[in-house]
Interface confidence: medium
């Protein structure tokens, strides 16, 4: 649903997006994710800031929390006990890395209206949650791991050893929380919260970054983080669980590591509970290719977890990594031993596979020349799952269901003709046993929540349509935008391009590369945005396009692992390659060509605009990686191998952007990093900057104090604003 | 065992309101979330359905008669009704009301029927 | 709206004979299919769902097979009461929808 187009008698009352409209999210969207509680009722936060519990079946709606409540304690979040008897309330949020931060909590009692006293908890707490059935809390506090049998109960402390940046009981360090876990949590209850298993994390060996913190003090603050650069000392992980009945009876028990993963330095991957009584872990070794899944059981004469081989499956890339960005996660049946699971299938495509006994014996489940993405949910009856096969667009998502529990068996798309011009691009959030489900379009349309039945998959209401946004947008030119493909030595180069409003064929625009380009990683999607691009378009005349080069994603590993163990060559050939096409098309001024990226992308516009081709004017890198042995073990090593003699160190050394100052001489460079990036660290603009002074390049930058790698709030405003002069400038445009 | 039955005017003039009504026994019709339908067959011709509705309120009509149909329900009569506006003699048909049973992935057929009741349009 | 399309519209057949009706979909359905049996002055009846499962109490002579966008309703062995009227209908997408149905008369 993009406002349609008007005619030309209708064009003077519309108007073009402005770079306030941008800063100012005027046209930002909602979206609309149930938080479920049961196979048909979930709780929502109206729009006056009550928390409201809507049951479906029969319509009604009641509100179990105050806005009045929430207000007393500066509550931000909430979440409700399974035996809804208590509500725990946050409240002084803080934030600390992507996911992670801390906050107090008020643990309220919804029977008879009045907080908890007694016992209440300590603050900052780093991580607290419910047990899945029952109230039952278990909390991180100054990284040990503390558990209640009721709110008001005094603790049990079930680690003792915790200290901060070197032992992490429950909650990930650094790398493992960005680059392994994607969470802020390290700890996971069993289904009926008998047991709870955690990661312990040793960081101890681990070698720190250390940065300054300007503040407003006499002395800038040092922040010391252990960071286990590619090549370095990792963190040792230890997987316990303790039985949450009798914590005091036993205490935790270790899960042994499978032998062929203890033999090297490893990772833990993820954990899955299974039953009360078994669960799934997975493992990694240091050299990304090798994951195991490794399914344990409770051994009650022991008081034990036992780990049988028979219960091991080994997952092996021969040709790049295991997985896509992460090892896939496992989806265990209802007879608790056979699974579902995504990965690679003998031609190289990402799918569903079901393994019952061993991965050798995998049925597969979905097949063909695209990919299956993520998988919602298995019921008895019917598989949920995500994919790209409609239309053969990778760069959209619909919602299929697999029956498993009749024959034969039936495939159906639930979303492919829904609102099919609005919405090409899906996620979704289910009800327990799929009773009810909640579809998220993305777009490309204007976005929009719709709730559905779980056995007939209609539409039964619409939870959020966007209709101030449809109605804001209704006045403006928006660009125009088309997702085409450019077929080029048998490699598919998918791409977005996004153009003026009133875009003619046979006038000649300025044209700005947008890259990210890292492996596994998707740009071309068909999703709703209005973003500093589209004003670029909208308002500035430039052509704008995306590609999806070799590394990126959901195209099948042929084009995924072509970057293996040699980041920073295809990537920027690729976007090279895609420009000179783009001036094949006749309306791009050649002499007026732009490249910038963020990150990873920061990385690849560097290379691109050092790559002695001539085709870009200028460019803009913000907080680019510069050298691959300054980021992180985790996710280098994935695609990069090590940085040692006998292992990779040479590619590490010929792909940094600093061995190509030389080339940026004959570019308008704009480098850009916040000085308190945690994640790719200051130091990588610094070397590059220093590389630049010592060949003599001239070239412009702009550091955020204090900021990091997301570059938030007034320094958001400042970095567009500037880049936008920076383009303006380069493309000979007036202000 | 469940058992639905329509009622209505078997004649409406053109331009009018057909109402009819579908009473449920044999079973709660709030208890579960099954949805109620309304199908139709004008005479010698095929099934068309017009509309459903869930005991919440929920409703989804066909998008060829959507401007023209409500379905509402009754959950203390054990009821639910169709309205359809602006009647023609196209709308001349046997109305039935109906009710699924689901099966298998998603998938799902009319279990139960109404015995159907004639409406005629004409002045 | 996924259209459907039955043939023939109507059929002449006897006692004992082999009858096959075919139901096309204007999209792929998967194996979201089901027939109906009709007869004069009755509400329709359940004999085929997911395109090949036999209702229960369905006697088994009447079979159902295909996906995709091909079905077809098979009747072994044509008994007196088994001339009706036979509807397909797809459960795949909203709105269901029902082909225009099939007659067996008797020749």
């Known amino acids: 649903l993009r406002p349609s187009r008007v005619h030309n008698s209708e064009e003077n009352t519309m108007r073009a997006l402005t770079l306030k409209d941008i800063l100012n999210g005027t046209f930002s969207y909602k979206t609309f994710f149930p938080n479920w509680i049961s196979g048909q009722e979930y709780l929502h936060q109206s729009a006056d800031n009550n928390i409201v519990l809507y049951n479906i079946e029969t319509g009604q709606s009641y509100t179990i929390l105050s806005n009045r409540t929430m207000k007393s304690v500066n509550a931000s979040n909430y979440g409700l006990s399974p035996d809804r008897q208590f509500v725990y309330l946050e409240s002084d949020y803080s934030k600390l890395w992507r996911y992670s931060y801390t906050a107090t909590y008020y643990i309220y009692d919804l029977s008879n209206g009045e907080f908890v006293r007694g016992n209440e908890l300590p603050r900052p707490i780093q991580y607290l949650c419910w047990s899945p059935v029952g109230s039952k809390l278990a909390y991180v506090y100054q990284n040990n791991i503390y558990l209640k049998q009721r709110p008001g109960d005094p603790p049990f402390q079930i680690t003792f050893n915790g200290r901060e940046n070197k032992i992490f009981n429950g909650i990930p360090d650094w790398v493992y929380e960005e680059e392994m876990l994607a969470t802020k949590y390290a700890l996971w209850w069993s289904p009926n919260g008998k047991f709870l298993a955690y990661a312990e994390f040793n960081d101890t060996d681990i070698p720190v970054i250390a940065y300054s913190y300007y503040g407003d003090e006499q002395y800038p603050r040092t922040i010391n983080i252990p960071y286990p650069k590619a090549g370095a000392k990792n963190p040792v992980v230890r997987i316990f669980i303790i039985d949450t009945t009798y914590p005091a009876y036993v205490g935790p028990q270790e899960v042994p590591v499978p032998a062929m993963i203890a033999s090297s330095d490893y990772y833990f991957s993820w954990l899955t509970w299974v039953t009360d009584e078994r669960v799934c872990l997975q493992w990694l070794k240091r050299v990304q290719n090798v994951s195991v899944l490794s399914i344990c059981d409770f051994r009650e004469d022991w008081q034990t977890w036992d780990c049988p081989k028979t219960q091991e499956h080994i997952e092996e890339s021969r040709t790049g990594w295991a997985g896509g960005f992460f090892v896939s996660t496992p989806v265990f049946s209802y007879d608790a031993i056979s699974y579902y699971k995504i990965f690679s299938d003998k031609d190289g495509y990402k799918h569903i596979h079901y393994i019952k006994d061993t991965v050798e014996n995998a049925i597969q489940i979905t097949s063909g020349k695209w990919e299956a993405i993520n998988i919602f949910r298995v019921t008895q009856d019917s598989l949920f799952y995500s994919s790209n096969e409609f239309e053969e667009y990778p760069g959209r998502r619909n919602i299929y269901r697999i029956s498993i529990g009749s024959y034969p068996p039936s495939k159906k798309c639930v979303t492919c003709h829904l609102r099919k011009e609005r919405c090409q691009y899906y996620t979704a959030s289910f009800s327990d046993y799929a009773k009810y489900y909640a579809l998220v379009c993305y777009g490309p349309g204007i976005p929009i929540s719709t709730l559905h039945d779980g056995r007939t998959d209609q539409e039964i209401k619409i939870l959020e349509e966007n209709k101030e946004l449809e109605n804001a947008l209704k006045n403006i030119q928006l660009p125009k935008e088309e997702i085409k493909k450019l077929e080029v030595d048998e490699i598919t180069l998918w791409y977005k391009m996004i153009l003026p409003p009133q875009f003619d064929r046979s006038k000649k625009y300025p044209l700005l590369i947008q890259v990210y380009g890292g492996p596994c990683s998707q740009s071309v999607r068909s999703v709703f945005a209005v973003n500093w691009i589209s004003y670029l378009a909208s308002k500035e005349g430039m052509v704008i396009a995306l590609v999806d080069g070799r590394g990126t994603a959901f195209q099948g590993d042929k084009l995924l692992y072509a970057v293996y163990r040699k980041l920073g060559v295809y990537e920027v050939e690729d976007q090279i390659t895609a420009v000179r096409k783009f001036i094949e098309m006749g309306f791009i001024d050649e002499k007026r060509i732009a490249i910038w990226g963020w990150s990873y992308g920061g990385y690849v516009s560097s290379l691109a605009l050092a790559s002695g081709t001539g085709l870009f004017k200028c460019g803009i890198a913000v907080a680019p990686v510069s050298s691959w042995e300054y980021y992180a073990s985790v996710y280098t090593e994935r695609f990069m191998g090590l940085p040692t003699k006998d292992d990779n160190l040479e590619h590490y050394k010929n792909s940094t952007v600093m061995a190509r100052a030389e080339y940026f001489r004959n570019v308008d460079y704009l480098l850009i990093h916040g000085t308190a990036d945690d994640n790719v660290h200051f130091q990588n603009s610094a070397q590059i900057a220093k590389a630049l002074v010592n060949a003599q390049v001239d070239f412009q930058a702009m550091w955020y104090s204090d900021q990091n790698h997301g570059l938030s709030g007034l320094s958001t405003n400042h970095l567009y604003t500037h880049m936008t002069h920076f383009l303006k400038q380069c493309f000979s445009l007036s202000d | 065992q469940l058992q639905l039955q329509e009622s209505g005017p078997g004649l409406v003039k053109p331009s009018e309101t057909l109402s009819l009504t579908c009473t449920v026994s044999?079973?709660?019709?709030?208890?579960?979330?099954?949805?109620w339908a309304w199908i139709r067959q004008p005479p010698g011709k095929g099934l068309e359905f017009i509309g459903n509705?869930?005991?919440?309120?929920?409703?989804y009509y066909n998008p060829s008669l959507k401007s023209r149909v409500t379905i509402s329900v009754d959950t203390s009569k054990n009821q639910f009704s169709l309205k359809l506006s602006s009647v023609t003699a196209a709308d001349t048909a046997v109305y039935y009301c109906?009710?699924?049973?689901?099966?298998?992935?998603?998938?799902?057929?009319?279990?139960?029927w109404g015995q159907g009741t004639l409406v005629t349009v004409s002045s | 709206d996924i259209q459907m399309t039955q043939s023939p519209s109507s059929l002449s057949a006897s006692v004992g004979d082999r009858v096959t009706i075919t139901c096309r979909a204007s999209?792929?359905?998967?194996?979201?299919l089901n027939w109906y049996q009709q007869k004069p002055g009755k509400a329709p009846k359940l004999l085929i769902y997911?395109?090949?499962s036999l209702q229960s109490g369905v006697p088994s002579r009447f079979s159902g097979s295909g996906s995709g966008t091909d079905f077809t309703l098979t009747i072994s062995s044509l008994q007196p009461e088994d001339f009706a009227t036979y509807y397909c209908?797809?459960?795949?997408?909203?709105?269901?929808?029902f082909g225009q149905g099939t007659k067996v008369e008797i020749k």
């Open positions: 509705i869930y005991y919440s309120g929920s409703t």
């Open positions: 209908q797809q459960s795949y997408s909203t709105p269901p929808t």
């Open positions: 999209q792929s359905i998967s194996s979201y």
């Open positions: 109906a009710r699924p049973s689901y099966y298998g992935s998603g998938n799902y057929y009319f279990a139960f």
């Open positions: 044999g079973g709660s019709i709030s208890s579960s979330s099954y949805f």
């Open positions: 997911a395109a090949s």
